[in-house]
Amino acid sequence: LQEKIEEIAAKYKHLVVKKCCYDGVRINHDETCEQRAARISVGPRCVKAFTECCVVASQLRANNSHKDLQLGR
């Protein structure tokens, strides 16, 4: 997960945009990525970075937990 997020974040050269990506990776079981992104007011660049990283992180976590279930963990 960390490796993939670092790969995505590396393309954002504006520090705030990069941090928006990292914010998207934080676990939040109560809201979707879209719901969380809707509260961002600093600009579309942040929304885009947040959403991309949030979605990728969610997908990777889902895949990992699915693998764990298959392995009977």
Epitope: K11, H14, L15, V17, K19, S41, V42, G43, P44, R45
Partner: antibody, heavy 118, light 111 residues
């Protein structure tokens, strides 16, 4: 209407520090990044750094080698720029500006003249 | 850091003529199809004023005689026709990455 009002002119001795304020009004202070630039007499614009008041995130121009600190007080909608170890070359007009959409500076403060002289 | 090179450093133009200023970036300021290049006008004793953002978008209240073009590394600010009140310094600025950087400026004088 959006306004950025800066503190008044300062005269400082070499080696001392200066702290310039930038009071924002007419918009939600935490929604936009505040940048600081400076302009030496007859010269161009030099970017110093910024703060995102909502999160307290900052980034600085490495040319200032740790001499600059940018802070923000959300309760008063004011950003501050402190420059330490002043030298004569720091004599300049210092500007704060709001960055809109993480793209461009749409509003600027009126500028604060800082003179460093022994 | 992205270096922005403006040319010419100064130019004198007659009223009614066209003024063209170029800004060349040391690397592309395009990110996912969006050009993070802006232009500002600065008159003596005043802070800079936004003219053009995202390479070609005119800020509100800016006269239509100002226009911006370009993409990637090469950008142009055009004033056509030039008026007496356009005497000022003009700066390009990129916001695609930190540190944000400005061009060295172009001084426009009216003959």
């Amino acid at each position: 209407q959006v306004q950025l009002v800066q503190s008044g002119a300062e005269v400082k001795k070499p080696g001392s520090s200066v702290k310039v304020s930038c009071k924002a009004s007419g918009y939600t202070f935490t929604d936009h990044i505040i940048h600081w630039m400076r302009q030496a007499p007859g010269q161009g614009l030099e970017w110093m750094g910024y703060i995102y008041p909502r999160e307290g995130w900052t980034n600085y121009n490495e040319n200032f080698k740790g001499r600059v600190t940018i802070t923000a007080d959300k309760s008063t909608s004011t950003a501050y720029m402190e420059l330490s170890s002043l030298r004569s070359e720091d004599t300049a007009v210092y500007y704060c500006a709001r960055e809109r959409n993480l793209e461009y500076f749409d509003y600027w403060g009126q500028g604060t003249t800082v003179t460093v002289s022994s | 850091d992205i270096v922005l090179t403006q040319s010419p450093a100064s130019l004198a133009v007659s009223p009614g003529q066209r003024a063209t200023i170029t800004c060349k970036a040391s690397q592309s300021v395009d990110f996912e199809g969006f050009n993070y290049m802006n232009w500002y006008q600065q008159k003596p004793g005043q802070p800079p004023k936004l003219l053009i953002y995202a390479a070609s978008n005119l800020d509100s209240g800016v006269p239509a005689r100002f226009s911006g073009s370009g993409s990637g590394t090469d950008f142009t600010l055009t004033i056509n026709p030039v008026e007496a009140e356009d005497t000022a310094n003009y700066y390009c600025q990129q916001s695609v990455e930190d540190p944000h950087t400005f061009g060295g400026g172009t001084k426009v004088e009216i003959k």
